[in-house]
């Protein structure tokens, strides 16, 4: 029995063909018989040589399923058929090509296509009567519409399209259509007429024109002064660079790809030349002035201002200021001088006529009458005169004539006319300099002299009548010079609060009591006059030590005796006891601790009267002695 051909398969599918592959069977055979079914149901048979292992079925219908049988034959014997089923590829198809919105210079194409993944669509647009005018467009495969602009007016076109899917082209779809006739321009008007420019406005259908062509003629000379082409989207244009007070004819044409509309015209007269007006001078000062002027609201490039001395035409200064200004400050002029001020404007390269005015500057500001008053030992007052409303500040310089290098400077508001100068030393000669400062000037300096008064005398501070509990303070002072005196008493160790005594200006001494015995005190005396306090006078003293009291002798023998005493209230370091026979001889001395109040005197001579003296000691200070006498047995 013949064996079946092996591994029958479809290796390639296309829209109108199928490629078959198989392997040769093992048994001997003469030929192959290939049968395949048509969509109509009938079968087609093909005989193939025995060495064939592939075959292409051609002329098939796209998108159809085919049954294929392959049999090996030997004589009248047939093998069992090998079978395979396969479908041809679908033909991607475009449909419903429509041309919409066939405007006068463009077309809109729409088409439908199955949902295959199209890579591109290729469109050709050509004039129906001129195949050489073909335009090709390639658009992305996701589009189903395309705009074709830039066509001729009222012209028949043939539009063709195909898609590209899986790298292959679909069949071509075509349609015929015509573009519309040219639209008309609407009306043309003129707005914002100036002396050298105007604005032209017009109406026209949207998207109708590629450009507009504008021609400007001078009516009197019929000369073309401007030719202008503007984009078709504009409906307004500024026409600059015209002459003032001149009549113009302006013509507008719409231009398409290959066609121009009938012109629309308008006649217009430009304005007269611009003028400056209302030149005035405000705020005249001694060194400057402010110039004001008026103009129409045109865009001036700048203004040129000339300022010259009326009596000296060579001394002219020119000033260029921005065209947006209507006033300018002119500084740096001479005081009390007549000037001629002129101005003209520059606009679009044109100079307006010049305007002029005459003006005189004010006199230079002055200061004077520098006076000194209310002199005291430490201060004085100054007053002066000055031109009002000019000065920002006055500078006062005070020089001590004894120390010329040391100067004090005071800056005072320009509104002031007086100054109080304080903190000066008494009995001193000063030179005072005054100058005024304005924005562009420092006046000449004026000067005067002043001498501070002498301070009244306070001197000869003395301390007397020192005792253990106080002392007397006295001093000398100028008569009727002082309102009061201040006496301050401070202990040297600064352990106690200072004591202050205020005395009338007539007093010259003060008795101090109730002080502590045997300590140092500092005394300060200062005088007050017209609220000023003098430098204090200073003196130091120590209150006297307290003396021992009530000497008593007891336990007297031939050669000894005991002496007792009462200690002073203030603590002392030691007591010194001196004893000597009344008849004379060398005194004997005993020193005992300050806490003791008795001692034994020894080595005495029998039957002799002794004089005994006791003093208290503290540091180098010694008290007044206390004395007594006794006679040995």
């Amino acid at each position: 029995e013949l064996d079946t051909p092996k591994d029958l398969q479809v290796s390639e599918t296309a829209e109108t063909s199928l490629t078959l592959l198989w392997k040769t069977p093992l048994a001997k055979f003469d030929r192959y018989r290939l049968n395949y079914s048509l969509p109509t149901g009938q079968w087609v048979g093909v005989q193939l040589p025995r060495n064939t292992t592939s075959y292409v079925l051609r002329g098939l219908e796209p998108g159809q399923e085919y049954n294929v049988l392959l049999t090996a034959e030997k004589g009248r014997h047939k093998s069992k058929p090998a079978r395979v089923k396969a479908s041809t590829e679908e033909v991607p198809s475009l449909e419903n090509l429509t041309v919409t919105e066939a405007g006068w210079d463009g077309l809109r194409l729409n088409w439908t296509a199955d949902d295959l993944a199209y890579e591109y669509f290729v469109i050709q647009v050509q004039e129906a009567n001129n195949v050489e005018t073909a335009h090709n467009f390639t658009v992305p495969g996701n589009l189903r519409a395309a705009d074709i602009p830039g066509l001729k007016v009222a012209t028949s076109y043939r539009v063709s399209i195909y898609g590209v899917a899986r790298g292959y082209r679909t069949p071509v779809l075509s349609a015929e259509t015509s573009t519309g006739t040219t639209p008309n321009l609407g009306e043309v008007t003129v707005a914002e007429v100036g002396w050298d420019a105007l604005t032209l406005n017009w109406t026209a259908p949207e998207g109708a024109y590629k450009n507009f062509f504008i021609q400007v003629l001078e009516a009197d000379t019929t000369q073309t002064v401007q030719n202008l082409t503007v984009p078709g989207g504009l409906r307004s244009v500024d026409l600059p660079g015209l002459k003032a007070a001149t009549r113009y004819y302006i013509t507008l044409r719409g231009v398409t790809q290959d066609f121009g509309t009938a012109p629309l015209s308008v006649e217009v007269l430009t304005e007269d030349l611009p003028q400056l007006g209302g030149l005035s001078v405000t705020e005249v000062s001694w060194d400057g002035l402010t110039l004001n002027w008026t103009t129409d609201d045109l865009a001036y490039k700048h203004f040129v201002v000339q300022v010259q001395e009326a009596n000296n035409v060579e001394a002219a200064q020119n000033l260029t200021v921005p065209g947006s200004l209507r006033a300018v400050d002119i500084p740096g002029l001479k005081a009390d001088t007549p000037y001629r001020v002129s101005i003209y404007g520059v606009i679009q390269g044109y100079r307006t006529p010049m305007l002029s005015t005459d003006v005189s500057t004010a006199r230079e500001p002055e200061i004077g009458n520098l006076n000194v008053s209310d002199v005291t030992p430490k201060s004085f007052n100054l007053s002066w005169t000055a031109t009002d409303g000019i000065f920002d500040m006055f500078t006062i310089e005070i020089i001590d004539s004894n120390r010329l290098l040391q100067t004090a400077e005071h800056n005072i508001s320009g509104a002031e006319r007086t100054a109080h100068i304080s903190g000066l030393p008494p009995s001193t000669d000063f030179i005072v300099y005054l100058s005024g400062i304005a924005p562009s000037i420092r006046t000449k300096t004026i000067s005067t002299t002043a001498t501070t008064e002498a301070l009244p005398l306070l001197e000869n501070l003395t301390i007397s009548d020192t005792n253990p509990y106080g002392f007397t303070v006295s001093w000398t002072a100028s008569e009727n010079a002082f309102d009061s005196f201040l006496v301050t008493v401070v202990d040297s160790g600064k352990l106690l609060d200072p004591q202050e005594f205020t005395l009338s200006g007539t007093q010259r001494k003060l008795e101090l009591r109730g002080l502590i015995t045997g300590i140092g005190y500092e005394v300060l005396v200062s005088g007050f006059t017209q609220g000023h306090q003098t430098k204090p006078l200073r003196a130091e003293t120590i209150t006297a030590m307290g003396s021992p009291k009530e000497v008593i002798f007891s336990d007297i023998t031939e050669n000894s005796a005991t002496v007792s005493w009462r200690a002073p209230t203030a603590q002392v370091e030691s007591f010194r006891i001196t004893y000597v026979p009344i008849t004379g001889g060398t005194p004997s001395m005993v020193t005992v601790d300050g806490t003791k109040t008795q001692t034994r005197l020894v080595k005495l001579i029998p039957g002799v009267e002794y004089l005994v003296s006791i003093i208290a000691m503290k540091g180098f200070e010694e008290s007044e002695p206390v004395s007594g006498s006794f006679t040995t047995a």
Partner: antibody, heavy 118, light 108 residues
Framework: QVQLVQSGAEVKKPGSSVKVSCKAS????????ISWVRQAPGQGLEWMGG????????NYAQKFQGRVTITADKSTSTAYMELSSLRSEDTAVYYC???????????WGQGTTVTVSS | DIQMTQSPSTLSASVGDRVTITCRAS??????LAWYQQKPGKAPKLLIY???SLESGVPSRFSGSGSGTEFTLTISSLQPDDFATYYC??????????FGQGTKVEIK
């Protein structure tokens, strides 16, 4: 009138690459397809591949897939064909050509001779 | 890829003869076919596109026909300038496609 001007002749070693340029003038370069065709000495025409500059995507013949790269620069209206791994059988005249709507190649460059020799 | 087979590969003819060259596609390509003429040392020249449309400037003695898989180029009256090699090319492939192997028309 479209004109296509190609770069000059090249002599290359086997295994190397060659890049041929094609500058277009006188038409809307980006909207039409540019194809590259070669012709070996005494042989027929062989379509290698093509590109639509507006999209920058290229299609290649199966035989050259992986060895040829076709690019385009819209700003200079220039297409390029680069062939790599050259062998002696790549010795040929290489043409660029513009495709019309139906795919017919209606304008051709003057041709660039590429010789591959060790 | 679609294969294109041209016949004959060489054709001898005389001036004034009617000449026919055929081209077969390995699968249907509808009418996506172009014919070219090439002379030695020159670039090819497009004669026919879309199987039967005559390219601008090409003499009317050249015509094309066919669709699907079978196509014909006919030169109605061979002229001395027509001795050259002729190629068919399928354009079903986008943006262009495979050529036939060529038919050389020589003087008999």
């Amino acid at each position: 009138q479209v004109q296509l001007v190609q770069s000059g002749a090249e002599v290359k070693k086997p295994g190397s690459s060659v890049k041929v340029s094609c500058k277009a003038s006188g038409g809307t370069f980006s909207s039409y397809a540019i194809s590259w065709v070669r012709q070996a000495p005494g042989q027929g025409l062989e379509w290698m591949g093509g590109i639509i500059p507006i999209f920058g995507t290229a299609n290649y013949a199966q035989k050259f897939q992986g060895r040829v790269t076709i690019t385009a620069d819209k700003s200079t209206s220039t297409a390029y064909m680069e062939l790599s791994s050259l062998r002696s059988e790549d010795t040929a005249v290489y043409y660029c050509a513009k495709g019309n709507f139906y795919g017919g190649l209606d304008y051709w460059g003057q041709g660039t001779t590429v010789t591959v020799s060790s | 890829d679609i294969q294109m087979t041209q016949s004959p590969s060489t054709l001898s003819a005389s001036v004034g003869d009617r000449v026919t060259i055929t081209c077969r596609a390995s699968q249907s390509i509808s009418s996506w076919l172009a014919w070219y003429q090439q002379k030695p040392g020159k670039a090819p020249k497009l004669l026919i596109y879309d199987a039967s449309s005559l390219e601008s400037g090409v003499p009317s003695r050249f015509s094309g026909s066919g669709s699907g898989t079978e196509f014909t180029l006919t030169i109605s009256s061979l002229q001395p300038d027509d001795f050259a090699t002729y190629y068919c090319q399928q354009n079903k492939k986008f943006p262009s496609g495979t050529f036939g192997q060529g038919t050389k028309v020589e003087i008999k």
